[in-house]
């Protein structure tokens, strides 16, 4: 059961795994989610009634029953891990914490003009986990404008104290904003340097993902299952060095080495979806259940929140109605305690963490008036929204922004009485693919902006909550929402897509069309539409000479812009005068202006859900963006 709300003045009793320090309850919840065993947590906020040495403690907890007794305690904030939830979460934390000193090993100090510059330095330094910046109002002359880069064994502060006129924050490496990526995998090569941890993994790719999410792993060496020393087979050595790169490497048969991908614009999702045949994973047994197949066993593991990995033993002929045994397992670190080969088992990992899709990493793969046909998988966030009344037809475009959410235009729902008549098809290139038996997503709820009246006056935005969740694949996955911190970005690579008309009097296209269209300034756009008010909540795109534009049927679809190799949903196709007319740009809903609205609507407002202001002990945040791209916390 997914419980997103935080419980104020509540403490969970018992079940302690470990205590870390976090600047907020929200971040404590993220730390809990990424911890292999944490299901619940109790955070202690700053409070006069509480011993200052306990301020900002985040106690990570586990429970066989998935719950613990609740006790009333002032300043305590408790909650549950997002492991139980189906929405995306991310380790990315762009919040800046005012008047908090996050303690760690200060390994670098330098002068910086601003906290943002300090955070950028931290993000671009391989060792940095978090930073503290003394503002120019800081009492100590020598400390003013000093940026202290810090790291710890756990990646979280060793202590957090109140300190006036400083600000602290975390590295944004997990936001896919660093520029230090090495994606190469080196066969038959072993790296030297310092081992920070040793885990067992079935292959080098799992080893790399574990390295990526380990706070101090910069590179790794994996010993395959045919490595000469039996006791070292399947060993994944997580490594670091002072320089941040391997100081030396040795050619070694049956070893594979590589780097953490944390500093990449495409951080892997924190899960391992492959099956490992003729492989048994050992660990603490959680349960043994009958299952028809290894796929069914993986589902059972995924649905059992404490299960981390499994081994499936296929049925012996005619035994147990053809069902095999599914061993659900766990360990202290989320990895098997031993990996055995040649016993006939099929093993794998829980998929519960696959939804922890990392910071927006939607990439381009190696309808539209004046457009050209798209290829399959080119616009995996694009959906076609159909109405079944009076007959089934394409109604509008839309964009996947989360695994239960489609963002589209409000004007699409004129005359739509009920979500029951709507169908969302994803992963579609040609409308002709849609047959009676084609799978679709039903719509549970249509959320139209309450200030929407008509497309031309703005607020032309709507959310569709799907009845079931979208499993992300290469052909259907989300697009990033633009970051509020990127308001000043000048997008130069923008595309409008859809199955809409290719000219004003036309019909819906079969193949998804695409057209590259330049953005137009709002001043320029206003000149072209003297009879309308072009607000900052609108964004315009089009060629002065016309010729390429969105048109009828493209409405609600995306204006997608690529920035730093990441696609952002910059606009929602809204309105325009004719189609592709000279000096009549298309007008789109300016998505960045609705990020807060999207966050508010996609987060279920449940009882006892507490805001930052309610938390006496939560720090005042200055947030570069409260919505971390398409993740709904």
């Amino acid at each position: 059961e997914c419980v997103t709300q935080l419980l104020k003045d509540t403490c969970f009793e018992g079940g302690d795994i470990t205590t870390v320090f976090t600047p907020s309850a929200k971040y404590c919840q993220v730390v809990c989610t990424y911890h292999p065993r944490c299901l619940l947590f109790t955070f202690t906020a700053e409070s006069p009634s509480e011993d200052p040495t306990r301020w900002f403690t985040c106690v990570l907890k586990d429970s066989v029953t998935e719950t613990l007794p609740r006790v009333n305690r002032t300043a305590a904030i408790s909650g549950y891990s997002f492991k139980q939830c189906s929405h995306q979460i991310s380790a990315c934390n762009k919040d800046i914490y005012v008047d908090l000193d996050m303690k760690g090993i200060n390994y670098n100090s330098s002068v910086a003009k601003s906290a943002q510059e300090c955070q950028e330095r931290c993000t671009d330094d391989v060792h940095c986990h978090f930073f503290t910046y003394a503002t120019r109002q800081f009492p100590s002359l020598e400390h003013r404008n000093i940026c202290l880069l810090k790291h710890t064994q756990t990646g979280t502060p060793t202590r957090i104290t109140k300190l006036d006129k400083v600000v602290s924050g975390f590295s944004l490496k997990s936001c896919a904003l660093s520029n230090l990526c090495h994606m190469n995998i080196f066969q038959h090569l072993a790296f030297s340097d310092v081992d920070v941890a040793r885990v067992l993994t079935p292959d080098a790719f799992v080893c790399r993902t574990i390295c990526t999410y380990h706070p101090n792993c910069l590179f790794f060496t994996f010993y395959t299952n045919v490595w000469k020393i039996e006791s070292q087979r399947n060993v994944c050595l997580l490594k670091t060095s002072e320089s941040g790169t391997p100081s030396s490497s040795t050619p070694q048969e049956n070893t594979i080495s590589g780097y953490s991908l944390l500093t990449c614009h495409s951080i892997p999702v924190f899960c391992h979806s492959s099956f490992y045949h003729d492989t048994d994973f050992l660990g603490e047994e959680l349960d043994i259940v009958a299952a028809k197949s290894h796929e069914a066993c993986q589902k059972l593991c995924t649905n059992a929140v404490r299960c981390q990995f499994f081994t499936y033993t296929p049925a012996q002929a005619s035994c147990n109605e053809g069902k095999g045994k599914c061993y659900l397992k766990l360990s202290s670190n989320g990895s098997p305690t031993k990996i055995l080969h040649g016993r006939g088992g099929i093993s794998g990992y829980t998929l519960r963490l696959c939804k922890m899709d990392n910071e927006c990493t939607t990439k381009i793969k190696p309808r539209i008036v004046g457009g050209t046909a798209s290829v399959r998988g080119e616009w995996p966030w694009q959906v076609t929204l159909h109405t079944t009344s009076p007959t089934q037809r394409h109604l509008c475009g839309g964009s996947i922004i989360g695994n239960q959410w489609i963002l589209t235009a409000a004007h699409c729902f004129y005359g739509v009485e009920s979500p029951k008549i709507l169908r969302v098809y994803s992963g579609i290139l040609n409308q002709s693919e849609i047959k009676e038996d084609t799978s679709f997503f039903g719509v549970q709820e249509i959320i139209i902006h309450d200030q929407y009246k008509m497309a031309e006056s703005g607020y032309d935005i709507a959310l569709l909550k799907l009845e079931t969740t979208v499993n992300y694949t290469d052909s259907q996955r989300p697009i990033c929402l633009p970051s509020k911190g990127d308001r000043n970005v000048i997008y130069t690579d923008c595309w409008v897509t859809g199955w809409g008309y290719r000219k004003l009097r036309d019909k819906i296209q079969n193949t998804l069309q695409k057209a590259k269209i330049p953005l137009v300034t709002n001043e320029e756009c206003q000149k072209r539409y003297r009879g309308h008010k072009i607000t900052h909540k609108m964004i315009c795109a089009g060629y002065r000479e016309g010729g390429k534009d969105a048109c009828k049927g493209d409405s609600g679809g995306p204006l997608s812009c690529k920035h730093n190799e990441v696609w952002h949903l910059v606009g929602i196709t809204s309105w325009g005068e004719g189609c592709a007319q000279r000096e009549r740009p298309g007008v789109y809903t300016n998505v960045v202006e609705y990020v807060d609205w999207i966050l508010e609507k996609t987060q279920a407002v449940e009882q006892k859900l507490i805001s930052e202001e309610d938390l006496g002990g939560e720090q005042k945040l200055i947030s570069e963006e409260d919505l971390h791209h398409h993740h709904h916390h």
Epitope: D101, N106, S109, V111, P139, S140, L141, E142, H143, N145, I146, L148, T161, L163
Partner: antibody, heavy 121, light 108 residues
Framework: QVQLVESGGGVVQPGRSLRLSCAAS????????MHWVRQAPGKGLEWVAI?????????YYADSVKGRFTISRDNSRDMLYLQMNSLRAEDTAVYYC?????????????WGQGTLVTVSS | DIQMTQSPSSLSASVGDRVTITCRAS??????LNWYQQKPGKAPKLLIY???SLQSGVPSRFSGSGSGTDFTLTISSLQPEDFATYYC??????????FGQGTRLEIK
Amino acid sequence: QVQLVESGGGVVQPGRSLRLSCAASGFTFSSYNMHWVRQAPGKGLEWVAIFLSYDGSNKYYADSVKGRFTISRDNSRDMLYLQMNSLRAEDTAVYYCAKSEILVVPTLDYWGQGTLVTVSS
Amino acid sequence: DIQMTQSPSSLSASVGDRVTITCRASQSISSYLNWYQQKPGKAPKLLIYAASSLQSGVPSRFSGSGSGTDFTLTISSLQPEDFATYYCQQSYSTPPITFGQGTRLEIK
């Protein structure tokens, strides 16, 4: 290794001037804040002045020397100076130059051996 | 300016003794406190920074604690070379940097 060597001390009459020098080696001089600290005979330590590394205009002084002493540095020669004018008897002290390092908080992590200034008629 | 007050001004102790020197700031200085040791005719030497962190090369018998306004320097087992004068110094609200008046530790 870090070394700081002061020179220029001596006996001087009240009202006269003296210039102290501090030669630095073993570290990137231009990157560090530098201080002068003094100690009157048989007394405690008293901070005198600081020259910040990252801003040429950032020189600060103790109230007791403000307007009379001037701190300066020559990064090309790894030298720190203290120009002392209008000297008074109460300026008699051993003068130390010290390197500052931010070890979580600002500290005076290396000191010279000191140079004695005696102001006497 | 922040005033720093050390106590005692002087104390006598024997080799092997545990010794504690305290330092009080006239207002909160967080953990912006350093301790120095000075032997006669020598320059001061940094012992402890940020109230409790041991400077590299300093023996582990030296330790510091405290936060806010009250701080202590502890020598767990006095050695002959520890007889010296000890100064606390705040670097929280500067300029000026201010020192305590010193504590002279003598052999009993």
